[in-house]
């Protein structure tokens, strides 16, 4: 079976406040009403789930309250923001999209976005 195509940027640099945003776009083969988006982090050949949200088309994405992710959706495009990132969180962040309803179920996995996080230099003590 052909996989659903998912596109995401190759590289994103997190802000000095540890926030990274990127767009995950999927080529929907059908008229999905319910979509699940999962962000996976791949580092040292290990894959872990960062966050996930199921949303109804036309509605907002709702991540769990303690999630480090937020997002908005527009058509077949999801704008994802990951917060609280530190240098040790640098890695490949993969967008996985599933069309949950109605059938047929489709799964698409992006190639990943390499997010670089640089911890800010501590401010030197000012002599005033």
């Amino acid at each position: 079976c052909k996989a659903m195509h998912v596109a995401q940027p190759a590289v994103v640099l997190a802000s000095s406040r540890g926030i990274a945003s990127f767009v995950c776009e999927y080529a929907s083969p059908g008229k999905a009403t319910e979509v699940r988006v999962t962000v996976l982090r791949q580092a040292d050949s290990q894959v872990t789930e960062v966050c996930a949200a199921t949303y109804m088309m036309g509605n907002e994405l709702t991540f769990l309250d303690d999630s480090i992710c937020t997002g908005t959706s527009s058509g077949n495009q999801v704008n994802l923001t990951i917060q609280g990132l530190r240098a040790m969180d640098t890695g490949l962040y993969i967008c996985k999209v599933e069309l949950m309803y109605p059938p047929p179920y489709y799964l698409g996995i992006g190639n990943g976005t390499q997010i670089y996080v640089i911890d800010p230099e501590p401010c030197p003590d000012s002599d005033f």
């Epitope: 079976c1 052909k2 996989a3 659903m4 059908g30 009403t33 319910e34 199921t54 109804m56 599933e98 949950m100 309803y101 109605p102 059938p103 047929p104 179920y105 489709y106 799964l107 698409g108």
Partner: antibody, heavy 124, light 107 residues
Framework: EVQLVESGGGLVQPGGSLRLSCAAS????????MHWVRQAPGKGLEWVSG????????SYADSVKGRFTISRDNSKNTLYLQMNSLRAEDTAVYYC?????????????????WGQGTLVTVSS | DIQMTQSPSSLSASVGDRVTITCQAS??????LNWYQQKPGKAPKLLIY???NLETGVPSRFSGSGSGTDFTFTISSLQPEDIATYYC?????????FGQGTKVEIK
């Protein structure tokens, strides 16, 4: 073991109501799309209604739209079919079925687990 | 909705015979065609998905082929336990629809 067990069938008069239940076990019910498929005596299979894992999306065959309501309680691992304004032509064995959403397959389009069915007879 | 037409509606064959059932879709459905077996008084059981893939645990005497609008289901050597009605189901366009079934009996 993955299992679906239907209940709630029986004899009902035309215009009456009935609520079918389907108890699920052995799999993650809340992430599975669930469906009702019926089979009239001596006839073929007809998809009736379906619901997404979250319960947020539903769909119905034209023949039951406006009369039947599908719902689920993920805390109880149970699927329901509320049938109102029943007609003689609704007489059938009603099966609940899991629609496979396999996370190592990129597209799926089949029912992989079925219950044993419950008979609904609409007659005066 | 896509219409599925199965033939024959019933057949009788001897143990060991090769049995073939065909299923035709009213429009092209790629390879999104599944086959189920239903024994008397029992629920349907998935045998083949996506036209030719054997479900886990299903004997290799069952096979399927085809794409587009024309599909074939074959039992290479009929066994007494294969007495059942067989249904095709299209999985290309929602809602899924089934063929009317083919009843297989032993001579």
């Amino acid at each position: 073991e993955v299992q679906l067990v239907e209940s709630g069938g029986g004899l009902v008069q035309p215009g009456g109501s009935l609520r079918l239940s389907c108890a699920a076990s052995g799999f993650t019910f809340s992430s599975s799309s669930m469906h009702w498929v019926r089979q009239a005596p001596g006839k073929g299979l007809e998809w009736v209604s379906g619901i997404s894992g979250s319960g947020g999306s539903t769909s119905y065959a034209d023949s039951v739209k406006g009369r039947f309501t599908i719902s689920r309680d993920n805390s109880k691992n149970t699927l329901y079919l509320q049938m109102n304004s029943l007609r003689a032509e609704d007489t059938a064995v009603y099966y609940c079925a899991r629609y496979l959403m396999s996370f190592n397959l990129t597209r799926t389009s089949w029912f992989d687990v079925w219950g044993q069915g419950t008979l609904v007879t609409v007659s005066s | 909705d896509i219409q599925m037409t199965q033939s024959p509606s019933s057949l009788s064959a001897s143990v060991g015979d090769r049995v073939t059932i065909t299923c035709q879709a009213s429009q092209a459905i790629s390879n999104y065609l599944n086959w189920y077996q239903q024994k008397p008084g029992k629920a349907p059981k998935l045998l083949i998905y996506d036209a030719s893939n054997l479900e886990t645990g299903v004997p290799s005497r069952f096979s399927g082929s085809g794409s587009g609008t024309d599909f074939t289901f074959t039992i290479s050597s009929l066994q007494p336990e294969d007495i059942a009605t067989y249904y095709c189901q299209q999985g290309d366009a929602w809602p899924w629809t089934f063929g009317q079934g083919t009843k297989v009996e032993i001579k």
